[in-house]
């Protein structure tokens, strides 16, 4: 069926970057400026996305691909394809309806985006707090009692199966 259709439909021969122009006997015409077609056989070209205001151009539009936007400094992308820009805050803060606010005591945020999260409760794992938390950093839990016992092994444990929560700085 597909093969038959392609023989019958001259538009299927129009490559990406062109459109099948009904006004010109279905000739493949190049996409006009500021438009693109990312697949073949298109009957129209799509208007290029314009990165304006708080958005800035990460990748220019071409005849075969849309422009890509990111956010100006002080903002970060949200949503698929960076559909929105949200204001950055400092580490140790979170964005509220009233702007950036410091994390409450007992919570932290080690990024410029997102919300303040509670410090880890070390006692849930049978550990104690070794380094206190701050607005910017989680606590550090000490080793487990088994790690400190006289018979403790010095062998490095296997890598944890769960993804670590923080990246180095």
């Amino acid at each position: 069926f597909e093969r038959t259709r392609s023989l019958q439909d001259p538009c299927s021969n129009c490559p990406a970057g062109t459109f099948c122009d009904n006004n010109r006997n279905q000739i493949c015409s190049p996409c006009p400026p500021n438009s693109f077609s990312s697949a073949g056989g298109q009957r129209t070209c799509d208007i290029c996305r314009q990165c304006k205001g708080v958005f800035r151009t990460r990748k220019e539009c071409s005849s075969t691909s849309n422009a890509e936007c990111d956010c100006t400094p002080g903002f970060h992308c949200l949503g698929a394809g960076c559909s929105m820009c949200e204001q950055d805050c400092k580490q140790g803060q979170e964005l509220t309806k009233k702007g950036c606010k410091d994390c409450c005591f007992g919570t932290f945020n080690d990024q410029k985006r997102g919300i303040c999260r509670p410090w880890t409760n070390c006692s849930l794992d049978g550990k104690s707090v070794l380094v206190n938390g701050t607005k910017e950093r989680d606590v550090v839990c000490g080793p487990s009692p088994a790690d400190l016992s006289p018979g403790a092994s010095s062998v490095t444990p296997p890598a944890p199966a769960r993804e670590p929560g923080h990246s180095p700085q």
């Epitope: 701050t134 550090v140 839990c141 444990p157 670590p164 929560g165 923080h166 180095p168």
Partner: nanobody
Framework: QVQLQESGGGLVEAGGSLRLSCAAS????????MGWYRQAPGKQRELVAV???????NYADSVKGRFTISRDNAKNTVYLQMNSLKPEDTAVYHC???????????WGQGTQVTVSS
């Protein structure tokens, strides 16, 4: 895996100094905290000092004012400068590393420090 390699241990007279080094290698992307624990024969491993990637420190009371921990983040290395050593500082000194929160701890094989009176 995280590998920790210590160096700098040895025999020293009371009142003397030593500098321990520990280099981390391997999967160190989650390592934000490095430090030293020590273990005397038949005793529990105990904290000496730890330092975070943003240079917060914590020392055992018994070494405050005598020992100084520092780190070189670019080299993934932590140092322990030990001054005014006492016989009771004699132990195997283990390098240790972990992340923030309740992350797993990684341990070096240890380096022997012996302080003679």
């Amino acid at each position: 895996q995280v590998q920790l390699q210590e160096s700098g241990g040895g025999l020293v007279e009371a009142g003397g100094s030593l500098r321990l080094s520990c280099a981390a290698s391997g999967s160190i992307f989650s390592i934000n905290v490095m430090g030293w624990y020590r273990q005397a024969p038949g005793k529990q491993r105990e904290l000496v000092a730890v330092i975070t990637s943003d240079y917060s420190t914590n020392y055992a009371d018994s070494v405050k004012g005598r020992f100084t921990i520092s780190r070189d983040n670019a080299k993934n290395t932590v140092y322990l400068q030990m001054n005014s050593l006492k016989p009771e500082d004699t132990a195997v000194y283990h390098c240790a590393a972990t992340g923030y929160g309740s992350s797993p701890w990684y341990w070096g094989q240890g380096t022997q420090v012996t302080v003679s009176s």
